[in-house]
């Protein structure tokens, strides 16, 4: 959960507003009480954003971009409050404000620079192209252009393609890696600098598993506690890739404690779910059941991605038969 | 304190123009609107015209919109009221007055002492 | 346009009288009224505003009432000083208009 807005204060009456797209804020703005007040907020000195005098609002040549977006706090203008409550945050909405305040004994100008971030919730994926494996870290809507990192066993690589598709108002990235042949951690962050959020994606490959034919596997799945935070809402998704494409096997949700299984040999242990620990068995393993498991558990500020590699060999009874 | 100056007077024919000007001082000009209010001689108030602060609104009485235009210079604190089409009627003498803020009151808290205009032929 | 009307039009009273000028609105103006003084050869000056704030500066003895259409100026003791005319102004909306004033004379 993020606060409405957040304000950095620099000198000179003028004060900085971080908001994020399609979110509510305030641009602050205070003066001593007095009589007579009238407010005017204008943006860039140009266009009216709102105007109050006589005890009431006057908008009649406000700029049709803030029609129905804009109101003061009524109740607290007679005790200096200014503020501008400001609805549906756009980056064309970017830019600095003023607000004018005339009472019987003064008039004060403030200035708010507003500033709007996006941050769409980035994803990790894990993806076969041919006979390559890739790792790709995306971001759908981001603004302004983040900073993204990989690292390879904790150490950064300096490698760092990035495919950036920019739009009006946002910017869409994608992030890919080559992994192919290579069983190391990998770990990409992407970092909004202006709303000072970070999101951090980890994938990890386990030691392949040979199995037998009809007999069960079990497949470990456990958050880093680095970056878990069983408060914070998230989603586990366990999946199987046949063909070049994942088949989710099974699902959990944090916030409603539901389970969804699509794969009736599947099954989870609801006891070390409730510890955090999301491993799952396969029971009575066919050869077809041969493959990449993946395990990704994601919220809002990460993504954990495990990957099995599991081989199902016929058993001996199978193999005398044939 | 608070300086409010009216210049630009005089006797001016039925159809002709004059520009009155205003000088401001002991005030933040940009901050507050003025208005222009004149008095016929021998009579009551008459509201003329006001400006913004910011020059963002212009309001005239309906005697004088469409001949008269206000403007206002912040930088050099000047207020200016140019008359076209001048009436034997718009005979008066020119007060510009300063708004209680930014020119959205409507009420005159400062006034300067008035130039006069005379229109005859 | 909102039409105001004074009453009355002159008024003698003597130095320490108590003194009340009546201003009625054509329609409702809400307490956007103000009250100015004008002496002869000189520029008005603004003595209430709001239909019953004192400006700054202005002796107490100027008061101001009413709402809606009905408003009064009252001089609680005339003084010597008092001799102008006094003009109520509707700012409620655009065009702001006055009354036509009131002479005051002292007896």
């Known amino acids: 959960i993020f606060p409405l807005a957040f304000f950095i204060y620099v000198p000179m009456n003028e004060q900085i507003v971080i908001g994020r797209l399609d979110e509510d804020i305030i641009l602050p703005s205070s003066f001593e009480r007095g009589s007579e007040v009238v407010i005017h907020w204008k943006y860039q000195d140009s266009y009216k954003v709102h105007s109050y005098y006589k005890g009431s609002d006057h908008l009649e040549s406000q700029d049709p971009r803030y029609a129905n977006r804009t109101s003061l706090f009524y109740n607290e203008i007679q005790n200096g409050n200014a503020s501008l409550f400001f609805r549906r945050v756009s980056l064309l909405d970017e830019g600095i404000y003023t607000c004018y305040v005339g009472t019987a004994i003064q008039v004060i100008t403030n200035k708010v620079v507003l500033k709007v971030g996006v941050f769409l919730t980035p994803v990790m994926k894990y993806e076969k192209r041919n006979t390559n494996s890739f790792l790709i870290c995306s971001v759908l809507s981001v603004y302004p252009r983040p900073i993204i990192t990989w690292k390879m066993d904790n150490t950064p690589i300096s490698e760092n393609n990035m495919e950036e598709t920019g739009s009006l108002d946002s910017f869409s990235i994608n992030s890919p890696l080559n992994i192919t042949g290579s069983n190391s951690s990998y770990e990409c962050t992407i970092e909004n600098s202006l709303l000072k959020q970070t999101w951090t994606g980890r994938w990890t490959m386990k030691d392949g598993l040979h199995k037998m034919q009809s007999e069960h596997v079990s497949l470990s799945c456990q958050p880093v506690n680095d970056y878990f935070s069983p408060n914070q809402d998230f989603k586990v998704t366990w999946s199987r890739m046949k063909s070049g494409t994942f088949s989710v096997l099974a699902y959990y949700l944090s916030s409603s404690q539901n389970t969804i299984i699509n794969e009736s040999r599947f099954s989870w242990n609801k006891e070390l779910i409730n510890q955090s620990d999301f491993s799952m068995n396969l029971m009575d393993l066919n050869l077809s059941d041969s493959g990449e498991y993946l395990c990704n558990i994601s919220s809002d500020e990460y993504t954990l991605l495990t990957i099995h590699t599991v081989h199902v060999e016929p058993s001996q009874e199978t193999a005398s038969h044939n | 304190q608070v300086q409010l100056v009216e210049s630009g007077g005089g006797v001016v024919q039925p159809g002709r123009s004059l520009r009155l000007s205003c000088a401001a001082s002991?005030?933040?000009?940009?901050?507050?609107?003025i208005h222009w209010v004149r008095q016929a001689p021998g009579k009551g108030l008459e509201w003329v015209a006001v400006?913004?602060?910011?020059?963002?609104?212009?309001y005239y009485a309906d005697s004088v919109r469409g001949r008269f235009t206000i403007s206002r210079d912040n930088s050099k604190n000047t207020l200016s009221l140019q008359m076209n089409s001048l009436r034997v009627e718009d005979t008066a003498v020119y007060y510009c007055?300063?708004?209680?803020?930014?020119?959205?009151?409507?009420?005159?808290?400062?006034w300067g002492q008035g130039t006069l205009v005379t229109v005859s032929s | 346009d909102i039409q105001m009307t004074q009453s009355p039009s002159t008024l003698s009273a003597s130095v320490g009288d108590r003194v009340t000028i009546t201003c009625r609105a054509s329609q409702s103006i809400s307490s956007w009224l103000a009250w100015y003084q004008q002496k002869p050869g000189k520029a008005p000056k603004l003595l209430i505003y709001k239909a019953s704030s004192l400006e700054s500066g202005v002796p107490s003895r100027f008061s101001g009432s009413g709402s809606g259409t009905e408003f009064t100026l009252t001089i609680s003791s005339l003084q010597p000083d008092d001799l102008a005319t006094y003009y109520c102004q509707q700012y409620n909306s655009y065009s702001y208009t006055f009354g036509q004033g009131t002479k005051l004379e002292i007896k």
């Open positions: 002991g005030f933040t000009f940009s901050d507050y609107g």
């Open positions: 007055a300063r708004d209680r803020s930014s020119g959205a009151m409507g009420y005159f808290v400062y």
């Open positions: 400006i913004w602060y910011d020059a963002s609104d212009k």
